[in-house]
Structure formats: structure tokens, C-alpha cells
């Protein structure tokens, strides 16, 4: 892969950074799983979806998740009206109506319903990382990444370049 | 304004070693991926290296590995390229090129620095 | 390593028409949905500039002149309407795998 790039250090939010499109460049439908091979599953229970890492048994089908990818500018470190380049985030869908949100305050990843224009929560930063595995930034607060904890998905903060192939933020995206 | 500036080339000797180096500005450098990219005097464009933001990576293209080693001083933000047992075919214009946030192209190149190996 | 293989090698364009350059990879250069073949702009004397990223997606400051399309392995960069400010060498870039690999370039001119 490109190798990795470092955390977000500005101090300004990725939440200052515009939608270049309000609809997405493309979409994916893909299973996803941790760097350990630990599968992200979805389940609807008491009217609500809750998400699970864990290992699938032999021949256990995948859970899919639609990735929308959206062209987004990148704001200047310099000042808040400056653009340094492009970047490209996703919103994550495992099943019709429902997206992955950020939930900052409670440093949890939770499913919500909920209709288009998405908020903001439900955006990340798609990282291309080294050894074929992505990561994903919040949009809302920079230097947060989904992650893995206790077998559940958390928000985790990374605080340095160096702690950003720590292996719980790493995820694998595959068609099967 | 996001700038690269490359600086140490010069012409040296087959075998001989140089040390390129890049001085960014304009973005926070310790958060992006770095490379250098040549081009011969062919203007055929050639990937060299890559460096993770947090050092973590490198990869080079075969040609150049373990004679060309790539590393970053993020406190004087600033790239480097060590090469040695330089080859007639190492010959080339090298560009420091910083990858977009997230990592998934080249976005910003220098202006670059020349290289040129010959007896 | 992928192979790009860029066509024509050199093309010459009327002011106000459009140039169409080609590129084609030797293998899938799709990773994670995304077609992962970035267009490079290059004038005498000075470095590459990003054109198009992702195979369809114009970098910061491209004009809307500048488009890119295609997938898998077949793309293309078309320039329309072509301006005197275009006189310039193309180059196709997969981002895909290491080796990052680029085509060997279009030389484009005014007719």
C-alpha cells in the first residue's frame, strides 16, 4: 500500500472540510473485518441494531456493509479558509436506512437510523493503509478512529503518527 | 501555501553515494506519506521510495533496494534519500512528492533536484 | 508489476476540440471499489501536476476541462475544449500496488 498516513494534528475539526458532491462517487458492498481476521456483525435486537466482532463459524456467511465514498476537501492547517488537496470519505450502510455514527461523547460507534443529507457523525476519513487494511476517521473530531474494543467497535484516539498502524484500528474490506 | 523544496543533487561518479533532502512547508508533515519519484532524461517516470507519516513504512521499487534508503525527520520537517553504489542508470530528475490526506495518490510535488551519475 | 500502456504516444489538437488520451493497465487496477488510476499534468520545466484522482475525480484548482472515466482497466483522460494553456505531457499513475507504476506519457500539442 501508499503507506500510512499520519494522524490529523490540526486542530481545526475534518468537520471544516465541504462535500465536494452531495451524491457519492461510487459505492462498495463489502464484508468488514478486522486486521486479526475477526468479523464486524450486524443484529437487530429489541428494534435496534447492535454490532459485534467476533469470529464466524466454518461456512457462517458474512455480513455486508455498503460503502458510499465522497470526494471531500481538505482544509489548510494554515487558516480555516485555505484547502490543502482532496481527501475521500465514506459512510458505512449495513442495512437500508441504517448508517455507522460516531458517537464522540460516549467514544462508541452506534447504528442510527436516519434520512439523507446524512450528519456529519456518519462520515469518516478512509485511510489507505499498509498490508491491505483501511482505516476510518471521524470527520467530527480528528484523530479519532473506529476501532476495536472488547469486542465491540469504539471510538479510540490516536494521538501520534507512530500509534496509527496500531493493529485495533485497522480493518479489511473483501467482496466475499 | 504547501510547498516541497529538494535540494543536493549533483553529478557524481558510478558507485558514488549522494543524500537528497526535502524541506516541507504549508501542511503538517509528520501526518502525510512521502515519496520520491525520478524522471530519466527520457521523461519516463519512475516511483522510488515511500515513507509512512509516523516512519512506520517504507517501500522502494527493486531497482533501488539496499542502495537507496529513505527516512524523514519530522521535527525539521524534512525528507530525505540516502543513495549509494549509484548506477549510470539512476541518472534522473528526483521529485519529493507528499501524498493527499488518507493516502491514496500523489498529490503535491517539488520542483526537484538533478542527479546525474557518469565516469 | 502493473503495466500501463498509454496511447498515443503523441497527439495534436485544434484549439477548441477535444483530446482524448488512453490508458490501458495490464491488470485490474480496482482496490476496495475504487479505481485506483490518477492523470498527471506535466509542462517544460516543471514537476507533475495532479490532474484526476480515483479515474473520474479532478484535484483541487483543475478546471472542469479535464475529465477522467473508465474502471478495471481501460481509462481515459479527455480535455475539452482544448486551450493553447494544454501544450503539454500527460502521464497516467496507478496507485493501486506497490510498485506505484506510471505510463510512459502523451505528448499533446495545438495543431
Known amino acids: 500500500a501508499f503507506g500510512i498516513s499520519g494522524v490529523q494534528k490540526y486542530t481545526r475539526a475534518l468537520h471544516d472540510s465541504s462535500i465536494t458532491g452531495i451524491s457519492p462517487i461510487t459505492e462498495y458492498l463489502a464484508s468488514l473485518s478486522t486486521y486479526n481476521d475477526q468479523s464486524i456483525t450486524f443484529a437487530l435486537e429489541d428494534e435496534s441494531y447492535e454490532i459485534y466482532v467476533e469470529d464466524l463459524k466454518k461456512d457462517e456467511k458474512k455480513d455486508k456493509v455498503l460503502l458510499s465514498y465522497y470526494e471531500s476537501q481538505h482544509p489548510s492547517n494554515e487558516s480555516g479558509d485555505g484547502v490543502d488537496g482532496k481527501m475521500l470519505m465514506v459512510t458505512l450502510s449495513p442495512t437500508k436506512d441504517f448508517w455507522l455514527h460516531a458517537n464522540n461523547k460516549e467514544h462508541s460507534v452506534e447504528l442510527h437510523k436516519c434520512e439523507k443529507p446524512l450528519p456529519d457523525q456518519a462520515f469518516f476519513v478512509l485511510h489507505n493503509m499498509h498490508s491491505n487494511c483501511v482505516s476510518f476517521e471521524c470527520k467530527t473530531d480528528p484523530g479519532v478512529f473506529i476501532g476495536v474494543k472488547d469486542n465491540h467497535l469504539a471510538l479510540i484516539k490516536v494521538d501520534s503518527s507512530e500509534n496509527l498502524c496500531t493493529e485495533n484500528i485497522l480493518f479489511k474490506l473483501s467482496e466475499t | 501555501d504547501v510547498n516541497l523544496v529538494e535540494s543536493g543533487g549533483g553529478s557524481v561518479k558510478p558507485g558514488g553515494s549522494l543524500k537528497l533532502s526535502c524541506v516541507a512547508s504549508?501542511?503538517?508533515?509528520?501526518?502525510?506519506?512521502m515519496s520520491w519519484v525520478r524522471q530519466t532524461p527520457e521523461k519516463r517516470l519512475e516511483w522510488v521510495a515511500t515513507?509512512?507519516?509516523?516512519?512506520?513504512?517504507?517501500d522502494y521499487v527493486d531497482s533501488v533496494k539496499g542502495r537507496f534508503t529513505i527516512s524523514r525527520d519530522d521535527a525539521k520537517n524534512t525528507l530525505y534519500l540516502q543513495m549509494s553504489s549509484l548506477e549510470s542508470e539512476d541518472t534522473a530528475m528526483y521529485y519529493c512528492?507528499?501524498?493527499?490526506?488518507?493516502?491514496?495518490?500523489?498529490?503535491?510535488w517539488g520542483a526537484g533536484t538533478t542527479v546525474a551519475v557518469s565516469s | 508489476d502493473i503495466v500501463l500502456t498509454q496511447s498515443p504516444g503523441f497527439l495534436v489538437v485544434s484549439l477548441g476540440q477535444r483530446a482524448t488520451i488512453s490508458c490501458r493497465a495490464s491488470e485490474s487496477v480496482a482496490k476496495y471499489g475504487l479505481s485506483l488510476l490518477n492523470w498527471f499534468q506535466q509542462k517544460p520545466g516543471q514537476p507533475p501536476k495532479l490532474l484526476i484522482f480515483?479515474?473520474?475525480n479532478r484535484g483541487s484548482g483543475v478546471p472542469a476541462r479535464f475529465s477522467g472515466s473508465g474502471s478495471g482497466t481501460d481509462f481515459s483522460l479527455n480535455i475539452h475544449p482544448m486551450e493553447e494553456d494544454d501544450t503539454a505531457m500527460y502521464f497516467c499513475?496507478?496507485?493501486?500496488?506497490?510498485?506505484?507504476?506510471f505510463g510512459s506519457g502523451t505528448k499533446l500539442e495545438i495543431k
Open positions: 515513507i509512512s507519516g509516523g516512519k512506520t513504512f517504507t
Open positions: 504549508g501542511f503538517t508533515f509528520s501526518s502525510f506519506s
Open positions: 499513475q496507478q496507485s493501486k500496488e506497490v510498485p506505484f507504476t
Open positions: 480515483a479515474a473520474s
Open positions: 512528492t507528499r501524498a493527499n490526506y488518507g493516502n491514496w495518490f500523489f498529490e503535491v
